[in-house]
């Protein structure tokens, strides 16, 4: 009797005939910016307060017939998905609705901006508990709308938005492209990305995760007891807003960065069929389907990390790409990736008082991506140690020499265009895990961090014959912070982290001869925090 979508987001330990996870988000208020809603529907009656905010454009067409049930359809359904009695995710959450979409589901950037400002002012006048803002709408890229979302997020509000239903790169839409917003794509009961007519869910690096978004049961505005199935990334975003409300109700002090990391951590991994996405978007799109944590408490001991991809650099010779972590996150490693294999590596550098990850394109290259590994590491003190090109036969080396600092990531950057061609591989001397090793013509950057109880170890996986992909994963209890390839593998396209696995990609094996250069070694740096583990044990 449980709708498929609620079953999908529920960890096995909660599963019974009915969906009844502990604490329904009762400490959290969810703001919904959408159409008008039918607030007397039995599913949401008494749970949703309709504010007096309304800022919508006129409906198109002279013959448009405004029918209440049609005007309320989208918003009523979403309110039900978030907090409905029968088919809602966070049955205890209270909601407030703002009307920014008209009866045809159309709105304006200015109307949405004014709505966000209304929420900000309400928050200042009457501060309550944690706030979640659900934006189940998408329009063309808007710098001003993204900036407004950033301001609200930095004021401590969690914003959740739909990726958009255009079967396109979510980065081309707002507010989906705002980095501070949690952007949600849609999947169906078969864990396939949702197709909607000739279009479907958006995808790409601006999507944080996916959630159920096809045939979602929710309140229908046709009558006060009616229910209907609706589909789209709006429905997917409503699931994540509900999950966020549940998590924040259990841990009201969670920051946006902590919440996002938890959403990613507790998601189902690698269940989406990526063949649906355009080939160039597959590596950028997170293969994550949102789920409730198995227990609403006790996740504090884990070291949480996520992978952040930059925008594409473009093909010019000196083009660079920059990946940034959120304000509350630490950049623990930096890597790069180029489909053509022509790149000049990457480096961690300070920008505005924060470390960023910058990747460099090479002459003749089609462009690069920078890939940041962004982690939650309280009381961390991280720095980058750089060794210039050594010009010595043993290659370039750099290690963490400060007392108590551990190596969390290695990057290498070079000026020459054809680094590594016809050069034998440089092997890391055993028993020296706290150092980065690179080509003699490359500068090497070590990310060195000190944090209470932080310990890290290096794990390698080498394959002597050419392989398009080599992976190495951190074991249970350890978190991947760094991912790189050992030097000597000139055909490497780059390295990146997928969940807890380091992936090193190489050129198509048919184009690389089976020489010594065919050897590919993936290097993972796996860390854990004993301090966080002890702290959480004390709290329980």
């Amino acid at each position: 009797s449980i709708p498929w979508n609620l079953e999908r987001i529920t960890p096995p330990r909660y599963r019974a005939d009915e969906y009844q996870p502990p604490d329904g988000g009762s400490l959290v208020e969810v703001y919904l910016l959408d159409t008008s809603i039918q607030s007397d529907h039995r599913e949401i009656e008494g749970r949703v307060m309709v504010t007096d905010f309304e800022n919508v454009p006129e409906e198109d067409g002279t013959r448009f017939h405004r029918q209440a049930s049609k005007c309320d359809s989208h918003g009523t359904h979403l309110a039900g998905v978030v907090s409905g009695r029968d088919a809602g995710v966070a049955k205890g959450a209270s909601m407030r609705s703002l009307r920014v979409l008209n009866c045809q589901g159309k709105g304006t950037v200015s109307g949405t901006l004014i709505g966000l400002e209304f929420i900000r002012k309400s928050q200042l006048v009457q501060p309550v508990g944690p706030l979640v803002v659900l934006l189940p709408l998408a329009g063309g890229y808007s710098r001003v709308l993204n900036a407004a979302c950033q301001r609200l997020a930095r004021a401590g509000v969690v914003l959740v938005t739909a990726a958009g239903n255009f079967r396109d790169d979510a980065c081309l839409y707002s507010p989906a492209s705002a980095p501070e917003v949690i952007t949600v794509g849609a999947t169906n009961a078969q864990d396939q990305p949702v197709t909607l007519g000739t279009l479907g869910t958006n995808f790409g690096r601006c999507v944080d995760l996916f959630a159920p978004g096809e045939d979602i049961i929710g309140a229908s505005s046709d009558c006060s007891t009616c229910f209907v199935s609706q589909s789209g990334t709006s429905q997917a975003a409503a699931h994540v807003a509900g999950i966020a409300a549940m998590m924040l109700s259990a841990e009201p002090e969670l920051t946006l960065a902590e919440l996002r990391q938890r959403l990613i951590h507790f998601s189902a991994k690698d269940v989406i069929n990526e063949a649906w996405f355009p080939e160039d978007q597959r590596v950028l799109t997170p293969n994550l389907v949102a789920a409730l944590p198995p227990s609403t408490h006790g996740a504090g001991w884990q070291l949480f990390c996520r992978t952040v991809w930059s925008a594409h650099s473009g093909p010019t010779r000196m083009a660079t790409a920059v990946a940034r972590c959120a304000p509350d996150e630490e950049l623990l490693s930096c890597s790069s990736f180029s489909r053509s294999g022509k790149r000049r590596g990457e480096r961690m550098e300070a920008q505005g008082g924060k470390l960023v990850c910058r990747a460099h394109n090479a002459f003749g290259g089609e462009g690069v991506y920078a890939i940041a590994r962004c982690c939650l590491l309280p009381q961390a003190n991280c720095s980058v140690h750089t060794a210039p090109p050594a010009e010595a036969s043993m290659g370039t080396r750099v290690h963490c020499h400060q007392q108590g600092h551990v190596l969390t990531g290695c990057s290498s950057h070079w000026e020459v265009e054809d680094l590594g061609t016809h050069k034998p591989p440089v092997l890391r001397p055993r028993g020296q895990p706290n150092q980065c090793v690179g080509h003699r013509e490359a500068s090497i950057h070590a990310s060195c961090c000190h944090a209470p109880g932080l310990e890290c170890k290096v794990k390698e996986h080498g394959i002597p014959a050419p392989q398009e992909q080599v992976t190495v994963a951190c074991e249970e209890g350890w978190t991947l912070t760094g991912c790189s390839a050992l030097p000597g593998t000139s055909h490497v396209l780059g390295a990146y982290a997928v969940d807890n696995t380091c992936v090193v990609r190489s050129r198509d094996v048919s184009t690389t001869g089976s020489t010594s250069e065919g050897a590919v070694t993936a290097v993972a740096i796996c860390c854990r925090s004993r301090h966080l583990a002890q702290a959480s044990q004390e709290l329980q």
Epitope: S1, W4, A87, N188, A189, S229
Partner: antibody
């Protein structure tokens, strides 16, 4: 399970059919309405769950409503047309679900004729 | 909407023989929630099988349901005269408005 209220009505005249149950509680089961035009197959109309939630086939388009009391389930045909001429059945779903699963108990049906 | 297509009627079966009726769905049936019903003229349908293969209480084991996804089959072995009836499958996909019955298959027993 027993249906009642079926009769001859003129097109456009609202008609309410009632399904009366005994021996079990509507607070534990979903109830479905299914119809069968003369000489034709079965057609699912809609259902009401124990919670009171109602849902309908996509072809319904607001032509029917379902409601219930502690022992009865009503199907209202808001504006009957001759195409609504059929025997209307009420059936219990032991799964109390959103998807047809176990329609284990059926009433004998009640005949509705819509004609001018 | 999900469309359930059944074996065209009528299907003939000899007493003691075996008859199979297929039910194909245009969309994957959610959780294999596919049911089979038997209906005789002037009577309401009788519940035979649920979840594609689970026999309803009191139904003889001669009736067997199988299949998953979009393709399902009802098999009646050791056919009896009393099995002459129209058989319907019912189910739906994840859209709650797509619950539906198949068109029915009449079984004639010789």
């Amino acid at each position: 399970v027993e249906e009642s209220g079926g009769r001859l009505v003129t097109p456009g005249t609202p008609l309410t059919l009632t399904c009366t149950v005994s021996g079990f509680s509507l607070s534990s089961y979903a109830m479905n309405w299914v119809r069968q035009a003369p000489g034709k197959g079965l057609e699912w109309i809609g259902a009401i769950r124990s919670s009171g939630a109602t849902f309908f086939a996509s072809w319904v388009n607001g032509r029917f409503t379902i409601s219930k009391t502690s022992t009865t389930v009503d199907l209202k045909i808001t504006s009957p047309t001759p195409e609504d001429t059929a025997t209307y059945f009420c059936a219990r779903d032991t799964n109390d679900g959103w998807y047809i699963n176990r329609l284990d108990l059926w009433g004998p049906g009640t005949l509705v004729t819509v004609s001018s | 909407a999900a469309v359930l297509t059944q074996t065209p009627s009528p299907v003939s079966a000899a007493v003691g023989g075996t008859v199979s009726i297929s039910c194909q769905s245009s969309k994957s049936v959610y959780s294999n929630y596919l049911s089979w019903f038997q209906q005789k003229p002037g009577q309401p349908p009788k519940f035979l099988i649920y979840k594609a293969s689970t026999l309803a209480s009191g139904v003889p084991s001669r009736f067997k349901g199988s299949g998953s996804g979009t393709q399902f089959t009802l098999t009646i072995s050791d056919v009896q005269c009393d099995d002459a009836a129209t058989y319907y499958c019912a189910g739906g996909d994840t859209n709650i408005s797509d619950n539906a019955f198949g068109g029915g298959t009449e079984v004639v027993v010789k």
